[in-house]
């Protein structure tokens, strides 16, 4: 089958890194600079991705594979193949249109990326709050109030200020 295909289509013999040049009687020509073909039998080479601006080159383009980009310090990749670079924030913050904003009361972010998430609702598991949550850290749930030994007490988180209702801890 392969031999038959080769007889029918001489381009199928062109390996990765080359293209089947119609202008030169369908012979295999190497990909020009700044282009590549990652599979055999290609009739054109693809233009290499250029990592500019906030993108930086993680892997150079070769005749058989595209360049790979990542982000400059202070930014992180988003999307397939690092299609976007998003600004890092500090822990305890999330990105908005206007840049990094502190997490609202009742939420936290322990990373430099992503959004603020609500503190864990300890009462869902019949537990109580052992350590209060902060902007950077989730609450720590402890044993249920009934399980506490005499004299011990669980922490009651402060009431929210002007935020919408956060579920009881």
């Amino acid at each position: 089958f392969e031999r038959t295909r080769s007889l029918q289509d001489p381009c199928s013999n062109c390996p990765a890194g080359t293209f089947c040049d119609n202008n030169r009687n369908q012979i295999c020509s190497p990909c020009p600079p700044n282009s590549f073909s990652s599979a055999g039998g290609q009739r054109t080479c693809d233009i290499c991705r250029q990592c500019k601006g906030v993108f930086r080159t993680r892997k150079e383009c070769s005749s058989t594979s595209n360049a790979e980009c990542d982000c400059t310090p202070g930014f992180h990749c988003l999307g397939a193949g690092c299609s976007m670079c998003e600004q890092d924030c500090k822990q305890g913050q999330e990105l908005t249109k206007k840049g990094c904003k502190d997490c609202c009361f009742g939420t936290f972010n322990d990373q430099k990326r992503g959004i603020c998430r609500p503190w864990t609702n300890c009462s869902l598991d019949g537990k109580s709050v052992l350590v209060n949550g902060t902007k950077e850290r989730d609450v720590v749930c402890g044993p249920s109030p009934a399980d506490l030994s005499p004299g011990a007490s669980s922490v009651t988180p402060p009431a929210p200020a002007r935020e919408p209702g956060h579920s009881p801890q």
Partner: antibody
């Protein structure tokens, strides 16, 4: 393919409760907020509240505090909204929607098809 | 509390350009992204514009969005009969609390 599929229409009596489900598929359920939004007949969209299925943390709009309860079952990737002490003004289509994790002020990229809840004596 | 105000109705003839505004009662709409949804009768809202001016895949480039300090707008050029729907703007009071405009009913004459 991301999908949010909601439970069917409900007819309820005033004073009773209703529980609407929203089954998610095609993504990691625990990594995105689920928001609940309702729309009364001929009216606009109204935020009820939201849940982070990853840890069960919830927020409620002031108007719905004490009456709405959100839960999430991570084993079935299903979010639930229960609304109690129903009154005729609660007659509406109830939607669940997903918010991406790009930014704190992002849009709702996927919506359930909506569940009509009718409150009538 | 943040209130987003939209005109209750808008209209245009096929081929025309129509703009729907979304005004903020106070503060600065520039602090948070504005998103626009189209709702056809009996269906769930569909995103037409997100993050002020971005168009999801599959939304015609006849739809565009813009935002200034205290208002945002959705523009539809080359109006078509299938554009007849309700349109809602959406932003935030805080990153926990979404706010919706009252909606604009667009009629294609």
């Amino acid at each position: 393919e991301v999908q949010l599929v909601q439970s069917g229409a409900e007819v309820k009596k005033p004073g009773s409760s209703v529980k609407v489900s929203c089954k998610a598929s095609g993504y990691t359920f625990t990594s995105y907020y689920i928001y609940w939004v309702r729309q009364a007949p001929g009216q606009g969209l109204e935020w009820i509240g939201n849940i982070w299925p990853g840890n069960g943390g919830t927020f409620y709009g002031e108007k719905f505090m004490g009456r709405a309860t959100f839960t999430a079952d991570t084993s079935t990737s299903t979010a639930y909204m229960e609304l109690s002490s129903l009154r005729s003004e609660d007659t509406a289509v109830y939607y669940c929607a997903r918010r991406p994790d790009y930014s704190g002020d992002d849009y709702f990229d996927y919506w359930g098809q909506g569940t009509l809840v009718t409150v009538s004596s | 509390q943040v209130v987003l105000t939209q005109p209750p109705s808008a209209s245009g003839t096929p081929g025309q350009r129509v703009t729907i505004s979304c005004k903020l009662n106070s503060g600065n709409i520039g602090s948070y992204y504005v998103h626009w949804y189209q709702q056809l009768p009996g269906t769930a809202p569909k995103t037409m514009i997100y993050r002020d001016d971005k168009r999801p895949d599959g939304v015609p480039d006849r739809f565009s969005g813009s935002s200034s300090s205290n208002s945002a707008s959705l523009a539809i050029s080359g109006l078509q009969s299938e554009d007849e729907a309700d349109y809602y703007c959406h932003s935030y009071d805080s990153t926990i609390t979404p706010v919706f405009g009252g909606g604009t009913k667009l009629t294609v004459l």
